[in-house]
């Protein structure tokens, strides 16, 4: 039977390689049955996850999944790091796996890993 619990679909070790100066949308796919839960993003700082209060967020829908989006407009070098989304559902807190942003400064874009390098590092798939 399909679960009616809230589910967050961020795959483990998810990573994104992005350029500073570009816009970027970090998605938290959320599946729920009735009332949409309250979802937040936080950024990992050591063992604590610091809530991102004053950031632009939005929702979008595709099929039967809702995506809670954290907007980076534009991406800044200090956006580098790991993020997690959390959903409050019937007084339960559900946390996603973390997703990591690797921000390359435009000035050092030539130092980005090559496609061949990435292909030889399959654990970076989807990340």
């Amino acid at each position: 039977k399909e679960s009616c619990d809230v589910q967050l679909y961020i795959k483990r070790q998810s990573e994104h390689s992005i350029l500073a100066g570009d816009p970027f949308e970090l998605e938290c796919p959320v599946k729920y049955c009735a009332n949409r839960p309250h979802v937040t993003w936080c950024k990992l700082n050591g063992t604590t996850c610091v809530k991102l209060e004053d950031r632009q967020t939005s929702w979008k829908e595709e099929k039967n999944i809702s995506f809670f989006i954290l907007h980076f407009e534009p991406v800044l070098p200090n956006d580098n790091g790991s993020y997690r989304c959390s959903a409050n559902f019937q007084s339960n807190l559900i946390e996603s796996h973390s997703t990591t942003l690797y921000v390359t400064d435009v000035k050092s874009a030539s130092e980005r890993p090559s496609k061949d390098e990435m292909a030889s590092r399959p654990w970076l798939l989807y990340r």
């Epitope: 679960s3 998810s14 992005i18």
Partner: antibody
Framework: QVQLVQSGAEVKKPGASVKVSCKAS????????MHWVRQAPGQGLEWMGY????????YYADKFQGRVTMTRDNSKNTLYMELSSLRSEDTAVYYC????????????WGQGTTVTVSS | DIVLTQSPSSLSASVGDRVTITCRAS??????????MNWYQQKPGKPPKLLIY???NLDFGIPARFSGSGSGTDFTLTISSLQPEDFATYYC?????????FGGGTKVEIK
């Protein structure tokens, strides 16, 4: 609605190369990773590899490493797969498929491109 | 690579029957409570169609007679009441580890 339309059937000689295209519509192509899967006549499905939305990650199954090249042109909403050094065992239907939820599954598939390798 | 073994490889059933297909993985495809198992339906001359992802989640538009269950290494696809349009080949597929792999398929035929 989401559509993935692939290029037409190809007949190639052993040792040649083939390039299959996959034109996407009905969704923001540049936001989705894409996969290639093939199916030999009367056989099961075989995953060939993946290319991420922004091409920063490309992964080929070991079996195809060195012979396959996956590329995409986000400005044209088109995905490509080139397979070189063709042999008769490469005769198959080749499918492109959209990645769903960044690495969970493949949710929309092209209609398939038949590649026949014969001397 | 993770090997997926489907059983049976084929079965004959009638409209209205309950049909169960199993898929066993050579190693666990769970991680931290998530099961990375998907099920597809394929009809002759057509591409596969996603039915279920993450072991038990019905893809959008898929009828509720299809359901998926299981964890670790053992997974099941169930069709609660077989309909004429369900006669097809069904594949399991894991996305826990690269390369992604498929089971050998189960052909559901009319009895």
């Amino acid at each position: 609605q989401v559509q993935l339309v692939q290029s037409g059937a190809e007949v190639k000689k052993p040792g040649a190369s083939v390039k299959v295209s996959c034109k996407a519509s009905g969704f923001t192509f540049s936001s989705f990773g894409m996969h290639w899967v093939r199916q030999a006549p009367g056989q099961g499905l075989e995953w060939m590899g993946y290319i991420s939305s922004g091409i920063s990650t490309i992964y080929y199954a070991d079996k195809f490493q060195g012979r396959v090249t996956m590329t995409r042109d986000n400005s044209k909403n088109t995905l490509y797969m080139e397979l070189s050094s063709l042999r008769s065992e490469d005769t198959a239907v080749y499918y492109c498929a959209r990645d769903w939820l960044r690495g969970y599954a493949m949710d929309y598939w092209g209609q398939g491109t038949t590649v026949t390798v014969s001397s | 690579d993770i090997v997926l073994t489907q059983s049976p490889s084929s079965l004959s059933a009638s409209v209205g029957d309950r049909v169960t297909i199993t898929c066993r993985a050579s190693q666990s495809i769970d991680y931290d409570g998530d099961s990375y198992m998907n099920w597809y339906q394929q009809k002759p001359g057509k591409p596969p169609k996603l039915l279920i992802y993450a072991a038990s989640n019905l893809d959008f538009g898929i009828p509720a007679r299809f359901s998926g269950s299981g964890s670790g290494t053992d997974f099941t696809l169930t069709i609660s009441s077989l309909q004429p349009e369900d006669f097809a080949t069904y594949y399991c597929q894991q996305s826990n580890e690269d390369p992604w792999t498929f089971g050998g398929g189960t052909k559901v035929e009319i009895k």
